[in-house]
């Protein structure tokens, strides 16, 4: 997150970190069910661990943390590169979470976002770009949903209805390492960090997010079919 600020503790209990050994964060994710996470399809890896209820990036033990293995990864069947449409994936945890103030799911919004909607994006991704500088604790950033026209103007021929753009002033954006993390609007999960320009936070180059309102049926049906 570029030019965000430290999230208040306990305010993002659905935020998950996907880790490679040894404790290397490579993507964010979101708890949407007691045993299921949502993340970006481009975050797919064969072997990884999941950390929930953790505030700092470092692997130091925190009393609220819960650790899991991802036992099943189900990318959306329509995910395609290089277009990056349908950039979402469900991850089944090896057991159900224990609900606490630090770990609980968030509902996926069934309403598509309108331009001007105020949202919050969070993650442990780099706070500088192209330099790499990872934060000590989870970062939060207020962003506003842009109209689909502004989104398409920023990225001609690259945007479809499975994506939406959001940003704030130049110099504020999600960035590398935030992928798969949540965009929360009006208390519901509206999007996932998908992609953006490089370096991050360039003027007139907003972040692009997976438009989850288009996928509520797929999410529900996939969880039911694999539970």
């Amino acid at each position: 997150i570029i030019n965000g600020s430290d999230c208040d503790m306990h305010t993002q209990p659905w935020q998950a970190a996907l880790l490679l050994r040894p404790n290397q964060l490579y993507c964010g994710a979101v708890l949407v069910h007691p045993q299921w996470l949502l993340t970006a399809a481009h975050c797919r890896k064969k072997v990884f661990r999941v950390r929930l209820g953790h505030y700092s990036l470092s692997p130091v033990y925190e009393s609220g943390q819960q650790m899991f293995q991802g036992v099943k990864s189900i990318p959306h069947p329509g995910y395609s590169h290089p277009g990056h449409s349908n950039d979402l994936m469900l991850i089944k945890l090896n057991r159900r979470i224990r609900p606490t103030k630090d770990v609980r799911p968030i509902n996926v919004s069934s309403h598509c976002p309108s331009a001007g909607t105020k949202c919050l994006v969070s993650g442990w991704g780099t706070t500088k770009s192209p330099q790499v500088h990872f934060p000590k604790v989870l970062q939060c950033l207020n962003i506003s949903v842009l109209s689909q026209k502004r989104c398409e103007d920023a990225y001609p021929r690259q945007i479809d209805d499975t994506m939406f753009c959001a940003g704030d002033k130049a110099g504020r954006d999600s960035c590398q390492g935030d992928s798969g993390g949540p965009v929360v609007c009006n208390g519901s999960l509206q999007g996932l960090v998908s992609w953006g320009d490089y370096p991050c936070a360039r003027p007139n180059r907003p972040g692009v997010y997976t438009n989850l309102c288009k996928f509520t049926k797929w999410i529900q049906e996939t969880i039911q079919a694999n539970s």
Partner: antibody, heavy 127, light 108 residues
Framework: QLQLQESGPGLVKPSETLSLTCTVS??????????WVWIRQPPGKGLEWIGS???????YYSPSLKSRVTISVDTSKNQFSLKLSSVTAADTAVYYC???????????????????WGQGTTVTVSS | DIQMTQSPSSLSASVGDRVTITCRAS??????LNWYQQKPGKAPKLLIY???SLQSGVPSRFSGSGSGTDFTLTISSLQPEDFATYYC??????????FGGGTKVEIK
């Protein structure tokens, strides 16, 4: 201003291992989120990608060379290197190192263009 | 593997001419295409990235367009220093990164 400089032997015998180093000056190889790339160009021919290594030390190799190639980074020396084993005359080429600038973040981070190049070093494979 | 086909392989043009070089990918690569210029005995130089974005320091007479499988590099008014070989390059999610065969722009 970032500069890249290739170094290594100009002559390698068939079946031996070609070893080249790229020294990065004017910037830190470990501070920025770039790819570090090796490319070669046989005499009178076009450009051929050999492989790349990223900020996280993940390597990506050309399938046609994968069994013979190793790319590594030495952050303490601000260098990255290429090893190509079991060389033949077909490996004779100008070898370039380059920096790969990602075209985006997230899903776009795997795509890049080479925005800074070394001047190239000629390697001849001959007995 | 994605194949990149450049055309023509060579062309002759005069100073001031408008020159167009095309590059075709064997499957869609969205806008992930870059263009390079290479002069004899020198390393390639990045001109255009992401199909249409001009690399810093490159003259505005160079422009790129296209998306999907068909791409174009245009030099609006050829200058003496533009006589060189031009390569397109795609950078895929999975290797290999591949270049086109090159287009040599010669003096008529």
């Amino acid at each position: 201003q970032l500069q890249l400089q290739e170094s290594g032997p100009g002559l390698v015998k068939p079946s031996e291992t070609l070893s080249l180093t790229c020294t990065v000056s004017g910037g830190s190889i470990s501070s920025d989120d770039y790819y570090w790339v090796w490319i070669r160009q046989p005499p009178g021919k076009g450009l051929e990608w050999i492989g790349s290594i990223d900020y996280y030390a993940s390597t990506y190799y050309s399938p046609s060379l994968k069994s013979r190639v190793t790319i590594s980074v030495d952050t303490s020396k601000n260098q990255f290197s290429l090893k190509l084993s079991s060389v033949t005359a077909a490996d004779t080429a100008v070898y370039y190192c380059a920096r790969g600038r990602p075209l985006g973040y997230g899903a776009k981070h795997y795509y890049y263009g080479m925005d800074v190049w070394g001047q190239g070093t000629t390697v001849t494979v001959s007995s | 593997d994605i194949q990149m086909t450049q055309s023509p392989s060579s062309l002759s043009a005069s100073v001031g001419d408008r020159v167009t070089i095309t590059c075709r990918a064997s499957q869609s690569i969205s806008s992930y295409l870059n263009w390079y210029q290479q002069k004899p005995g020198k390393a390639p130089k990045l001109l255009i990235y992401s199909a249409s974005s001009l690399q810093s320091g490159v003259p505005s007479r160079f422009s790129g367009s296209g998306s999907g499988t068909d791409f174009t590099l245009t030099i609006s008014s050829l200058q003496p220093e533009d006589f060189a070989t031009y390569y397109c390059q795609q950078s895929p999610y999975f290797p290999p990164l591949t270049f086109g065969g090159g287009t040599k722009v010669e003096i008529k």
